[in-house]
Interface confidence: low
């Protein structure tokens, strides 16, 4: 007899792991044999869909390789034309080990801003997400929270938040770890120690000190009255993200010195500035009152004769003192090409030390004249013959200009080293050096009528002369 369909085994909830097989059974009793159709989420499953296998006259539905998208309500419907159609439904719960679908990435962030490290996960049951910083589980606090999505949010990022992070997704089926990522916290440049203002005497050395920090470590530049510092020496050291810069200056004029700390954040820069003034006590322009100023010798004619980085007096009665004095010594130097080998080194030393006198910095920069004894040694001992010839020429008016006369001192007007040893300059080139004597040609003249300590009195002795330029 015809019989309407009856589903004898209603569908149940099926749990299946991804890539596993899942089977729904829909046993039907009826006569004639029913037609059985299947739906997923009310959408008909087509018989020729290769992801499914339908057997036993449609009573068995097998999902051959479960995907996470197969989750849903599956229904079977049986109809044989006798009575109405019958339906039974069951759920497929796709169980899934945790999977991190959007892992965290390296982040560079400026201190004080908000950082979000993403960590989006999949899994069934829904995984719980936690974070590890370094080697330890990250504890949430008022600034740090794991969002519903699994992402880590850090408010008001601090330097101590920098480090290595990874997220962990966990459910009953397993655990997934993200790769380790780096959170780098960048800090705007900040000056820790500003340079101090100074009030100093003319010609003093001053060191301005500026300390800055930041991430990355900033660079420090110095500005003098709005321009890059053109003189002075800068020493820098970096320790524990702190840069220390010292600018040593030789002060010949007042100025505003600015320390600028700069660091880079992506395409942008951050800067911090601090300024200090250097004023000169009882400042009056050297050109007006002091008749000159002290400066390091940076010419070329006397650089083998004067001490390295010698502080020399530049006479501001010339429009361009450095140039004029160099020209003066240059002109006279050329005349020394013809003098005797005995005279020449001594004359060069006298010439350079007379034109570029040693300078005593102070409120009033003061030239230190050559000691009379050294001048007389050149005149009467080393260069007696040449000196006489030169004086003769002078009397006869053979010199075209007075220039060379300015470069020859009048020994009698110079201070003696016996009056005040600090008031006059010695010529080390003429001092006897027992360790390293450089022998002059034998002298035939008798003992000079000057008293120079350490100058030997015998005619066979040696004198120390610093090497001078080759005049070829």
């Amino acid at each position: 007899l015809p019989k309407a369909p009856v589903i004898t085994t209603p569908l149940e909830t099926v749990d299946a792991l991804v890539e596993e097989v899942a089977t729904f059974m829909c046993a039907v009793e009826s006569y004639p044999q029913p037609e059985i159709s299947w739906t997923r989420n009310k959408i008909l499953i087509k018989l020729f869909d290769t992801r499914y296998s339908i057997r036993e006259n449609g009573q068995l539905l097998t999902i051959l390789s479960v995907e996470d998208s197969d989750d849903g309500i599956y229904c079977c419907t049986a109809n044989n034309g006798v009575g109405g159609a019958v339906e039974s439904c069951g759920a497929l719960q796709v169980k899934m080990k945790p999977k991190i679908t959007r892992p965290p990435i390296n982040v560079k962030i400026i201190e004080g801003l908000k950082a979000v490290l993403p960590c989006t996960t999949m899994g069934n049951p829904k995984p719980s997400v936690s974070w590890i910083k370094g080697d330890s589980p990250l504890r949430e606090n008022s600034r740090t929270a794991v969002l519903e999505s699994g992402s880590l949010r850090i408010h008001n990022v601090q330097k101590e938040d920098a480090g290595q992070y990874r997220c962990v997704a966990k459910n009953s089926l397993g655990t997934a770890y993200s790769k380790v990522v780096k959170l780098e916290v960048e800090v705007f440049a900040r000056i820790l120690r500003a340079p101090e203002s100074h009030n100093v005497t003319f010609g003093s050395f001053v060191t301005l000190h500026c300390t800055a920090t930041g991430i990355p470590v900033p660079t420090i530049t110095w500005i003098e009255n709005g321009n890059a510092v053109s003189s002075g020496s800068i020493q820098e050291s970096v320790k524990d993200r702190v840069i220390d810069s010292r600018l040593q200056l030789f002060i010949t004029k007042p100025g505003l010195y600015t320390c600028i700390a700069t660091n880079k954040h992506g395409e942008k820069f951050s800067t911090a500035k601090a300024a200090a003034t250097v004023s000169i006590a009882e400042w009056s322009k050297p050109q007006k009152d002091n008749k000159g100023y002290c400066a390091q010798y940076r010419g070329e004619v006397c650089n083998a004769v004067l001490a390295k980085d010698a502080l020399v007096f530049l006479n501001t009665s010339y429009a361009d003192p450095e140039e004029a004095q160099e020209l003066l010594v240059h002109t006279a130097w050329n005349e020394l090409k013809v003098v005797s080998p005995l005279c020449r080194p001594a004359a060069e030393a006298l010439l350079c030390n007379h034109v570029f006198q040693e300078c005593s910095p102070g409120v009033v920069p003061t030239p230190i004249p050559i000691c009379r004894e050294y001048c007389l040694a050149v005149k009467e001992l080393f260069c007696a013959k040449e000196w006489l010839a030169m004086e003769e020429k002078t009397h006869r008016g053979l010199y075209r200009s007075e220039m060379h006369l300015l470069s020859v001192p009048e020994c009698s007007k110079l201070p003696s080293m016996h009056w005040d040893p600090t008031a006059c300059a010695r010529l080390p080139h003429l001092d006897y050096n027992k360790e390293n004597p450089k022998t002059f040609p034998p002298m035939t003249s008798s003992k000079p009528s000057v008293d120079i300590p350490n100058l030997p009195s015998s005619s066979s002795s040696s004198f120390s002369v610093s090497p001078t330029y080759s005049m070829t």
Epitope: E300, N303, E323, H330, M471
Partner: antibody
């Protein structure tokens, strides 16, 4: 009449060497500083090197330091530029120039006509 | 390394006045840079015009004068003539740890 005559230019392969000379006449050579200045085809002037009157010190543009050597022989009244490890960017007309005698680097008050150096493979 | 800047090109009418300038990419040009000016006509070697800011080389006409104006060196040609059409270069002495001499990129002056 003051004259500066450069020689020694030519075609050289990258990595090669050349020695330029500049013969001076008509002035007291050993009283003046000298310089080499170059000019790439269609480009501006570029200071290369300088030497004072006595050869006591030498100065170079940063990009040629360690490759070029300036020297002078005052007896022969000649300035030299030894160029090693030449690069294509060294291609230029090289001028020898006399300094005006001021300290530091001084103006260049007399120039030679130049010698062409071509660095190419 | 500081860059020396000049106007790429300028023009002047015969008899007119033109000022060429020479600046520094970072900072001001001062007399301590001893600004020098050179003239170069096509196919010729350069020739010195002005040295140390405002001094004329011998044989240079008085219509060429040098100065420092504001934060730049300046070359002024007063009463320009057709033969003044040339490239003009400034040269600056630099001292920042080591001595250096740097030319500007040059100004092409056209006398219309």
């Amino acid at each position: 009449e003051l004259q500066l005559v450069e020689s020694g230019g030519g075609l050289v392969q990258p990595g090669g060497s050349l020695r330029l000379s500049c013969a001076a006449s008509g002035f007291t050579f050993d009283d003046y500083g000298m310089s080499w200045v170059r000019q790439a085809p269609g480009k501006g002037l570029e200071w290369v090197s300088a030497i004072p009157w006595n050869g006591g010190s030498t100065y170079y543009k940063e990009s040629v330091k360690g490759r070029f050597t300036i020297s002078r022989d005052n007896a022969k009244k000649t300035l030299y530029l030894q160029m090693n490890s030449l690069k294509s960017e060294d291609t230029a007309v090289y001028y020898c120039a006399k300094r005006s005698g001021r300290i530091a680097f001084g103006a260049l008050d007399a120039w030679g006509q130049g010698t062409l150096v071509t660095v190419s493979s | 390394q500081a860059v020396v800047t000049q106007e790429p090109s300028l023009s002047v009418s015969p008899g007119g006045t033109v000022t060429l300038t020479c600046g520094l990419s970072s900072g001001s040009v001062t007399s301590s840079n001893y600004p020098d000016w050179y003239q170069q006509t096509p196919g010729q070697a350069p020739r010195g015009l002005i040295y140390s800011t405002d001094s004329r080389h011998s044989g240079v006409p008085s219509r060429f004068s040098g100065s420092i104006s504001g934060n730049k060196a300046a070359l002024t040609i007063t009463g320009a003539q057709s033969e003044d059409e040339a490239d003009y270069y400034c040269g600056l002495y630099m001292y920042s740890g080591s001595k250096n001499y740097v030319f500007g990129g040059g100004t092409k002056l056209t006398v219309l």
